[in-house]
């Protein structure tokens, strides 16, 4: 477990011509706030996909009113960091989206109006526990300067927050092979030996002998990159031979939560709700006392003076869970279905739906082909919200309304000439080549190196490509 922290340094006009107009005016004062969305891995994901690593909203910045005639300066920013707690391992590689929102402070009763000013996105590598990383991103005429870091929450340490620290058993030194836990030099790394051969870059373990894979990797030792292109379903188990995620049981099948924990599915994995006295990804950490500091986010620990008596975390407002690990906001009730992204607009919640879903709560699974006709004998193919027409020969385009030029892609190899034909295309091959696309060289003795030409066609003759 740990926290990703984002510090916004400035938001204002970028260098160069075309300075943007100020987003606020004397008639319509406004203030800024920011939203950050984190996703594991380096995948190019749509803005709509869930913030699987977490998301956070900043406080509102000071009210700003444009000075007439003045160019837009750097705008006043909210105080404080944006913090995104993460419960599992820090993935090392992550994608981010940072949105700058404007809150217009008119006198409307229904709450202030919100609008998105700028959105920047990027993919980065970052080790937990490292120094602040600085970044500058541009969105149109705006420039955003910020720093970020990931830090582990005790007792977790390491670049992925997967190693655990424990108080020293001996006053002078740590056990054999165990290092002090910087910066907590009075604590030692807990012994944790992963499965032999487990990839140090792409695998980690939270219990001795296991090898759990970071996003994008699979196989028993996390050495096989995942390819989802030929897969039917986006969830495991992984196939070590193909690296393909094949359809299988859900993440909660067999209940991975130990010690009476209850399992609930999340968009990427699962989450265990642990009984008192246990915590960790799978409720596997036990014997916890208040001395271990099990309450996150400023929770007050009561009881649990020894490992046999349970502790209770009294959470501050805004947090809940047996360890105060769950941030509570109005999106915590998950109103958006089918992986939709919940946005709290202040006066209400809104769902940004993933492709293929619609409705206020993303409750409608779009029947891609309903009411859609593919022209000229094409057939409609369902496809994740974006219907696709499989067109008859000679036609193309989204709805098969365009006459396709079958020769546009230069399908005839080795200098063959292409002729459009009512049923497709015909290649007239250059001397020495044959085949539907002139792909086979002809041997000097007239025999082809690959399948012979059909009866009645000489090697140099045009052939129809069906």
């Amino acid at each position: 477990a740990g926290v990703f922290e984002l510090q916004i340094h400035s938001f204002g006009p970028g260098p160069g011509p075309g300075a943007p107009r100020s987003p606020c005016s004397a008639r319509l004062p406004c203030r800024l706030f920011f939203r950050v969305c984190l996703k594991p891995g380096l995948s190019e994901e749509a803005a709509e996909s869930p913030c699987a690593l977490g998301a956070a909203l900043s406080a509102r910045g000071p009210v700003y009113t444009e000075q007439p005639g003045a160019p837009a300066p750097d705008l006043p920013l909210p105080d404080g960091l944006l913090q995104v707690p993460f419960r599992d391992a820090w993935p090392g590689t992550f994608s981010f989206i940072i949105e700058t929102w404007r809150e217009e402070l008119g006198d409307q009763i229904g709450g202030p109006a919100w609008s998105l000013l700028a959105r920047v996105a990027g993919r980065r590598r970052l080790a937990a526990g490292g120094p602040w990383a600085r970044d500058i991103q541009r969105a149109g005429a705006w420039e955003l300067r910020f720093s970020y870091r990931a830090r582990c929450e005790p007792p977790a340490v390491g670049t992925a927050c997967t190693r655990l620290c424990r108080p020293r058993s001996a006053p002078s030194r740590c056990g054999p092979g165990l290092r002090p836990c910087a910066p907590l030099e009075d604590e030692c790394e807990a012994p944790l030996v992963c499965r032999a051969g487990c990839s140090p870059e792409h695998g980690f373990c939270e219990q001795p002998g296991e090898c759990r894979c970071l996003e994008g990797w699979t196989g028993p030792l996390c050495t096989v990159p995942v390819s989802t292109s030929s897969c039917l379903s986006p969830r495991g188990p992984s196939s070590a031979t193909t690296g393909c995620l094949v359809p299988g049981p859900g993440p909660c099948d067999g209940n991975p939560c130990a010690n009476g924990g209850s399992c609930s599915e999340t968009p990427r994995s699962f989450e265990c709700t642990c009984p008192r006295g246990f915590y960790g990804l799978r409720c596997e950490v036990s014997g916890v006392t208040c001395a271990d500091g099990p309450c996150f986010n400023g929770g007050l620990c009561v009881g649990g003076a020894d490992p046999d008596s349970a502790y209770i975390c009294h959470c501050p407002p805004g947090f809940q869970g047996s360890n105060c690990e769950k941030r509570v906001d109005r999106c915590s009730l998950q109103p958006c279905r089918n992986g939709g992204l919940c946005l709290d607009l202040g006066h209400a919640l809104r769902c940004r739906c993933r492709a293929g879903f619609a409705g206020p709560r993303c409750e409608h699974d779009l029947d891609d082909c309903a009411g859609r006709a593919c022209a000229n004998g094409g057939t409609c193919v369902e496809g994740g919200g974006a219907h696709r027409c499989s067109c008859a020969l000679g036609f193309g385009g989204r709805d098969c309304r365009e006459r396709a030029d079958p020769c546009a892609a230069r399908p005839c190899a080795h200098g063959g000439r292409c002729y459009a034909h009512f049923s497709g295309l015909v290649c007239a091959c250059a001397p020495g080549y044959m085949g539907a696309r002139c792909e086979f060289p002809v041997h000097p003795d007239g025999a082809s190196a690959l399948p012979a030409a059909p009866p009645g066609l000489r090697p140099g003759d045009p052939q129809r490509y069906l």
Epitope: I109, P360, E363
Partner: antibody, heavy 120, light 107 residues
Framework: EVQLVQSGSELKKPGASVKVSCKAS????????MNWVKQAPGQGLEWMGI????????IYNHKFKGRFVLSVDKSSNTAYLQISSLKAEDTAVYYC?????????????WGQGTTVTVSS | DILMTQSPSSMSVSLGDTVSITCHAS??????MGWLQQKPGKSFKGLIY???NLEDGVPSRFSGSGSGADYSLTISSLESEDFADYYC?????????FGGGTKLEIK
């Protein structure tokens, strides 16, 4: 017509448990959250918690953690409030109230209330 | 938690009068507030949402206004059925909180 019909009054001894039901009709049950509110004699209103009937996700008022459990049965369009280890101070009228799940509206429809009396 | 301070706690008024009840939140709640009516021995009925919008079926003599942290409920031309308890509620932030209530009595 939207209706929230709650179960009848309960008289319980300290230490016992009670389960109050709230049956919804006249709307799509999973499109609205269900709030639970306590009104103790001579006291104000206290919000106890809220549940999303679609997913079962709950949020509790920190003053009502531990002995109070919210649940739903989607098949019967019914929300439940269970209180265990009852105490005298749990004596109150308990109300369910629906709220649009995108928070476009406040608590527009309420149940008629269930009186729970805890007495030895 | 957001504290909702409602005033007055009670008022005696006559039929046909116009009355206003106010609610002050301990922080801005961006219009996320509603007004409720409870008749003696009965349950609650939603009157106003988002500070100023009338729930379905609520007579137009009820109106809400306000922004930020200060809101008010106004009832014009009071009718006999309007004598009841009124509560404000904020739903900007968990936990939701209620005002202490205002008892409207016939003079």
């Amino acid at each position: 017509e939207v209706q929230l019909v709650q179960s009848g009054s309960e008289l319980k001894k300290p230490g016992a448990s009670v389960k109050v039901s709230c049956k919804a009709s006249g709307y799509t049950f999973t499109d609205y959250y269900m709030n639970w509110v306590k009104q103790a004699p001579g006291q104000g209103l206290e919000w106890m918690g809220i549940i999303n009937p679609y997913s079962g996700v709950t949020i509790y008022n920190h003053k009502f953690k531990g002995r109070f459990v919210l649940s739903v049965d989607k098949s019967s369009n019914t929300a439940y409030l269970q209180i265990s280890s009852l105490k005298a101070e749990d004596t109150a009228v308990y109300y369910c109230a629906r709220q649009d799940s995108l928070l476009d509206y406040a608590m527009d429809y309420w149940g008629q209330g269930t009186t729970v009396t805890v007495s030895s | 938690d957001i504290l909702m301070t409602q005033s007055p706690s009670s008022m005696s008024v006559s039929l046909g009068d116009t009355v206003s009840i106010t609610c002050h939140a301990s922080q801005g709640i961006s219009g996320n507030m509603g007004w409720l009516q409870q008749k003696p021995g009965k349950s609650f009925k939603g009157l106003i949402y988002h500070g100023a919008n009338l729930e379905d079926g609520v007579p137009s003599r009820f109106s809400g206004s306000g922004s930020g942290a200060d809101y008010s409920l106004t009832i014009s031309s009071l009718e006999s059925e309007d004598f009841a308890d009124y509560y404000c509620v904020q739903y900007a932030q968990f936990p939701y909180t209620f005002g202490g209530g205002t008892k409207l009595e016939i003079k």
